[in-house]
């Protein structure tokens, strides 16, 4: 499995998106886990709602949230108030029974807040093409089931 780097700023939120094949993983709950060492186990941080149909509901564990757009095929994890100790290797997982398939390996890199004088050498301000609101977040559009919408699997 290839690894994707997501970089965020200490003290801010980082949004990680793990795309997947919605057909292949239809009906499966998802999870976010932290890899303990290169060959070690992956320690569960948070998983989607116990009822798969409610996977779009955001679930929190501490400062980490998870939500799943099961139709679009995007699992989104939010790490709130990112801290240096949040840096490291994670996995997005698809669960079936007691098994877990890796959807994506994610390397979270935490960087200093450019406006934090303790870390800043020369001050940096966002240019025209960057804003703090947008710059540190990978946006992904999630949609939940509308009232009365039947959750059929997508057709190819």
């Amino acid at each position: 499995h290839n690894t994707t780097v997501f970089q965020g700023v200490a003290g801010q939120s980082l949004q990680v998106s793990c795309p997947y094949d919605s057909m292949k993983h239809w009906g499966r709950r998802k999870a976010w886990c932290r890899q303990l060492g290169e060959k070690g186990p992956c320690q569960r941080v948070v998983s989607t709602h116990n009822l798969w149909l409610l996977s779009f509901l955001r679930r929190w564990n501490g400062s980490t949230a998870i939500t799943d757009d099961t139709l679009g095929g995007t699992l989104t994890i939010t790490l709130r108030n990112l801290q240096p100790h949040d840096a490291g290797l994670y996995q997005c997982q698809s669960l079936h029974g007691s098994e877990a398939d890796t959807l994506r390996k994610v390397l979270v890199e935490v960087l200093a807040d450019p406006l934090d004088h303790r870390d800043a050498g020369d001050l940096w301000f966002p240019g025209e093409s960057e804003s703090f609101e947008d710059a540190h977040v990978e946006h992904s559009i999630s949609r939940s089931l509308l009232e009365g919408e039947i959750p059929f699997p997508p057709t190819s």
Partner: antibody
């Protein structure tokens, strides 16, 4: 003004090591990853890896593991790359570059030319 | 590793032409694509990141489009200063990889 100033050209013998530097100015050094890119004369670009100056964590292209070692020094806002067991294949221009929050390399150093010859 | 394949390594164009350079990834890179311009003896210059976002100071004649595996860099009306080699680069999967480059030369 953001600048990445790289050390001068190097002419070294096969089997030796070299350490080149990339001094950043004009921005908060620990707030951006610093990457290293190799370019052989008349050829394309090859990503070596990056250093996170905030955490001192690094990440390498498998191809360069054991060849390149990336470090940084926050106090001097400088990133370093050491290349070991040099051969003629390592002769190239090496650039440092900063990656933006959209993951592109928005500022580049001028390059350090490495020549490995006996 | 994700392979990045650029349409052609070199092609001749005329000043004022609309130029389109394509880049195909071996798998979906979810818009984590950048375009660079490099002139002989110089470091590359970032033109576009996130597949479509034009960097500050880059002329508006440059634009980026695409999604999934297929991406395009367009120059609406080629100027003398645009004669260079153009590279695409993905940052979705480690190792980050570049296309082989497309060299524009004047007819």
């Amino acid at each position: 003004e953001v600048q990445l100033q790289q050390s001068g050209p190097e002419l070294v013998k096969p089997g030796t090591s070299v350490k080149m530097s990339c001094k950043a100015s004009g921005y908060s050094f620990p707030s951006f990853l610093i990457h290293w890119v190799k370019q052989k004369p008349g050829q394309g670009l090859e990503w070596i890896g990056y250093i996170n100056p905030y955490s001192d964590g690094s990440n390498y292209n498998e191809k360069f593991k054991g060849k390149a070692t990336l470090t940084s020094d926050k106090s001097s806002s400088t990133a370093y790359m050491e290349l070991s067991s040099l051969t003629s294949e390592d002769s190239a221009v090496y650039n440092c570059a900063r990656s933006s929050y959209r993951y592109g390399f928005d500022y580049w150093g001028q390059g350090t030319t490495l020549s490995v010859s006996s | 590793d994700i392979q990045m394949t650029q349409s052609s390594s070199s092609f001749s164009v005329s000043l004022g032409d609309r130029v389109t350079i394509t880049c195909k990834a071996s798998e979906d890179i979810y818009n984590r694509l950048a375009w660079y311009q490099q002139k002989p003896g110089n470091a590359p210059r970032l033109l576009i990141s996130g597949a479509t976002s034009l960097e500050t100071g880059v002329p508006s004649r440059f634009s980026g489009s695409g999604s999934g595996k297929n991406y395009t860099l367009s120059i609406t009306s080629l100027q003398t200063e645009d004669v260079a080699t153009y590279y695409c680069q993905q940052s979705w999967s480690i190792p980050w990889t570049f296309g082989g480059g497309t060299n524009l030369e004047i007819k």
